[in-house]
């Protein structure tokens, strides 16, 4: 399953609207009945369903964490959507959390980028004014960090 | 390497209660269902149920309704089959088996456990 | 219950030899979907069922070609165009397209 999570089984309730199967498959924003003969829609808000398929229940919405803002709720065919708040963003290498966009640029660095949900800030070396390739850079620790412990490597 | 590997032979008596366990690797375990079979010595084979890991949504044959109970634990990525009120029409090699979620795919038993064998006596 | 039956019960056949099991089903086994839910599993002595077929005549990955089912509504056939030592066993047909799941007794292909 390509999607996030699978959505408790569902017994058709009288408010679940029900079709026949096109070819086998139902249409997005519903799921298959266990015997194969029947599409059951999903459940607004609490499940979905993005193509046609024969999958045996819809799946389950997608809760934005804290730290993320809804950008569009769940509706039976398309999954919630979030982002990450003002100040943090999403790696691609580690997308279940948003992480804290760096206050500054390592010495000799100059900012070319605001952070953005998606995107740390850029930093290019200043004589340069080019990207810097990805690397790892070991910040000397500020004041705020030595008091606090937190000073740390940071790849770019 | 898919892999089910289900829990060792089991002597109980008559009236009592078993578990036994179908422990899966090799593969995502919330991403299929898991059933279970029954085969009596020397006999054919009977499809007790199936249990969707992720949601413990389950679905039963009519015959094994108050007899078998289906449940499982995403963590461990094993599935469980409870027996009650035993007999010894019960005595029989019981099997997990694994199926897909789409329909299509749901009573293809891809991947076998090796066999719980169950012996009810007095 | 969709009853299974399976013709001959024991099999015998000399190994490079043809044979042919036969499944019956009591009702048609054709689903509203079009799709025809018959499947072959074999049990090698000792051990846990396989999967062979899947849908009348698909074979299931790393199953030998000279395996092949056909047939259709109530009648089905698994035919092994050479038989082999490593293919002795009881042969099982099931079908799913109705509830509940049922197999076949099972053939036993056993040497002459």
């Known amino acids: 399953i390509t999607q996030q999570d699978l959505a408790p089984q569902q017994r058709a309730a009288p408010q679940q609207k029900r079709s026949s199967p096109s070819e086998g498959l139902c249409p997005p924003g519903h799921h298959i009945s266990e015997d194969g003969r029947d599409c059951i829609s999903c459940k607004y808000g609490q499940d979905y369903s993005t193509h046609w398929n024969d999958l045996l229940f819809c799946l389950r919405c997608t809760r934005c964490d804290s730290g993320e803002v809804e950008l569009s709720p769940c509706t039976t065919t398309r999954n919630t959507v979030c982002q990450c708040e003002e100040g943090t963003f999403r790696e691609e290498d580690s997308p279940e959390m948003c992480r804290k966009c760096r206050t500054g640029c390592p010495r000799g660095m100059v900012k070319v980028g605001d952070c953005t949900p998606w995107s740390d800030i850029e930093c290019v070396h200043k004589e340069s004014r080019t990207v810097a390739a990805p690397s790892v850079f070991i910040f000397p620790p500020s004041d705020e960090q030595l008091k606090s412990g937190t000073a740390s490597v940071v790849c770019l | 390497e898919v892999q089910l590997q289900q829990s060792g032979p089991e002597l109980v008596k008559p009236g009592a209660s078993v578990k036994m366990s179908c422990k899966a690797s090799?593969?995502?375990?919330?991403?299929?269902?898991m059933h279970w079979v029954k085969q009596k010595p020397g006999q054919g084979l009977e499809w007790i149920g199936y249990i969707i890991p992720y949601n413990d949504g389950t679905k039963y044959n009519e015959k094994f309704k108050g007899k078998a109970t289906l449940t499982s634990d995403k963590s461990s990525s094993t599935a469980y089959m409870e027996l009650s009120r035993l007999t010894s029409e019960d005595s029989a090699v019981y099997y997990c088996a694994r199926g897909g979620i789409n329909y299509d795919y749901l009573y293809y038993f891809d991947y076998w456990g090796q066999g719980t064998t169950l012996t009810v006596s007095s | 219950d969709v009853v299974m039956t399976q013709i001959p019960l024991s099999l015998p056949v000399s190994l490079g030899d043809q044979a042919s099991i036969s499944c019956r089903s009591s009702?048609?086994?054709?689903?509203?979907?079009?799709?025809?839910?018959l499947h072959w599993y074999l049990q090698k002595p000792g051990q846990s069922p396989k999967l062979l077929i899947y849908k009348v005549s698909n074979r299931f990955s790393g199953v030998p070609d000279r395996f092949s089912g056909s047939g259709s509504g109530t009648d089905f056939t698994l035919k092994i165009s050479r038989v082999e030592a490593e293919d002795l066993g009881v042969y099982f047909c099931s079908q799913s397209t109705h509830v509940p799941h049922t197999f076949g007794g099972g053939t036993k292909l056993e040497i002459k």
């Open positions: 009702q048609s086994l054709v689903h509203s979907n079009g799709n025809t839910y």
């Open positions: 090799g593969y995502t375990f919330t991403s299929y269902v």
